[in-house]
């Protein structure tokens, strides 16, 4: 015998109190799959969380973080404070990058400057707390008569992959 609840579509639930009739999910709840015996409570984006997508009868709300914070965890389960470029977030708060490291993001930790000499290149632009070193041509290319080399562009702010 087929379970009558299997006919209940997403956005409804199989109401045992009403002879297993498919009833719409109540306000502030949803069911994302068919055949559900209950609807799930919608996530509420409060405090440092803000609503990225409203809850509907068939899908949960999605949250992101208010300005000055960024998401961590699957589905943005946590908001973590941003720091300024040139800083990293430690357990004790934002702190400036140590000499020889940089951070061009508002999150993450300070990264060591590129060591141009490892690839046989020279330093064209010194690094700062906010920017990596820019490597120029190899010293051999700087000899008289060598063709000019266009320095690479500094790294743009990379995107953050969805977590």
């Amino acid at each position: 015998l087929q379970d009558p609840c299997s006919n209940c579509p997403a956005g409804t639930f199989c109401d045992n109190n009403r002879n297993q009739i498919c009833s719409p999910c109540p306000p502030n709840s949803f069911s994302s799959a068919g055949g559900q015996r209950t609807c799930d409570i919608c996530r509420q984006c409060k405090g440092v969380f803000r609503t990225r997508k409203e809850c509907s009868s068939t899908s949960n709300a999605e949250c992101d973080c208010t300005p000055g914070f960024h998401c961590l965890g699957a589905g943005c389960s946590m908001c973590e404070q941003d720091c300024k470029q040139g800083q990293e977030l430690t357990k004790k708060g934002c702190k400036d990058c140590c000499f020889g490291t940089f951070n061009d993001q508002k999150r993450g930790i300070c990264r060591p400057w590129t060591n141009c000499s490892l690839d046989g290149k020279s330093v064209l632009v010194n690094g700062t707390k906010e920017r990596d070193v820019v490597c120029g041509p190899s010293p051999a290319d700087l000899s008289p008569g060598a063709s000019s080399v266009t320095p690479p562009a500094p790294a743009r702010e990379p995107g953050h992959s969805p977590q």
Epitope: K91, P112, D132, V134, C135, P152, P158, S161
Partner: antibody, heavy 120, light 108 residues
Framework: QVQLVQSGAEVKKPGASVKVSCKAS????????MHWVRQAPGQGLEWMGW????????NYAQKFQGRVTMTRDTSISTAYMELSRLRSDDTAVYYC?????????????WGQGTLVTVSS | YVLTQPPSVSVAPGETARITCGGD??????VHWYQKKPDQAPVLVVY???YRPSGIPERISGSNSGNTATLTLSRVEAGDEADYYC????????????FGGGTQLIIL
Amino acid sequence: QVQLVQSGAEVKKPGASVKVSCKASGYTFTGYYMHWVRQAPGQGLEWMGWINPNSGGTNYAQKFQGRVTMTRDTSISTAYMELSRLRSDDTAVYYCAREPGYYGSGLDYWGQGTLVTVSS
Amino acid sequence: YVLTQPPSVSVAPGETARITCGGDDIGDKRVHWYQKKPDQAPVLVVYEDRYRPSGIPERISGSNSGNTATLTLSRVEAGDEADYYCQVWDSSSDHPGVFGGGTQLIIL
């Protein structure tokens, strides 16, 4: 979806060089650092270095400095790792792995691995 | 910087497995955990001490304080049998990427 596809297995003689490629798709190649990690038979994971595909800037583990070169070709969204003066203990599976847009987090996408066998 | 893991941890199905990763003041660093199965690429299961990427089940969790980080797998299943590696970034050294030696999780 993000994908990292690596070149096929290689067999090399001691003293030779090998160049492994890693073709990226499903995201902006120049926006994310690429790392290389290897695993020798029966051993653990070992970090080799990274490249910034936008600037070409690199950082290599001291152990590999002078033997490893990481490069990229942005026109075909491909990163390369070349290891020279190969020894038998360089026999390993070599992986490329993407950093998730900022330094200090875990490596979120990995290539399938390339087995490099060094044998006389 | 050195990360120390036990070579193996054994657990019965349905029980809880705890895999440790030791390092000097590791609580001040962000620890990441990877699952590695034979002939497969590593998979990030926990990042920045305790956050799960999308698709990783809630029964996998992480914590980090003092000199020890811990990966916890509750209600362990046969499919969890794998090697697990902790990892940190150490910008102050000439070897920024550091992995632990790995722990083999054995399901009894």
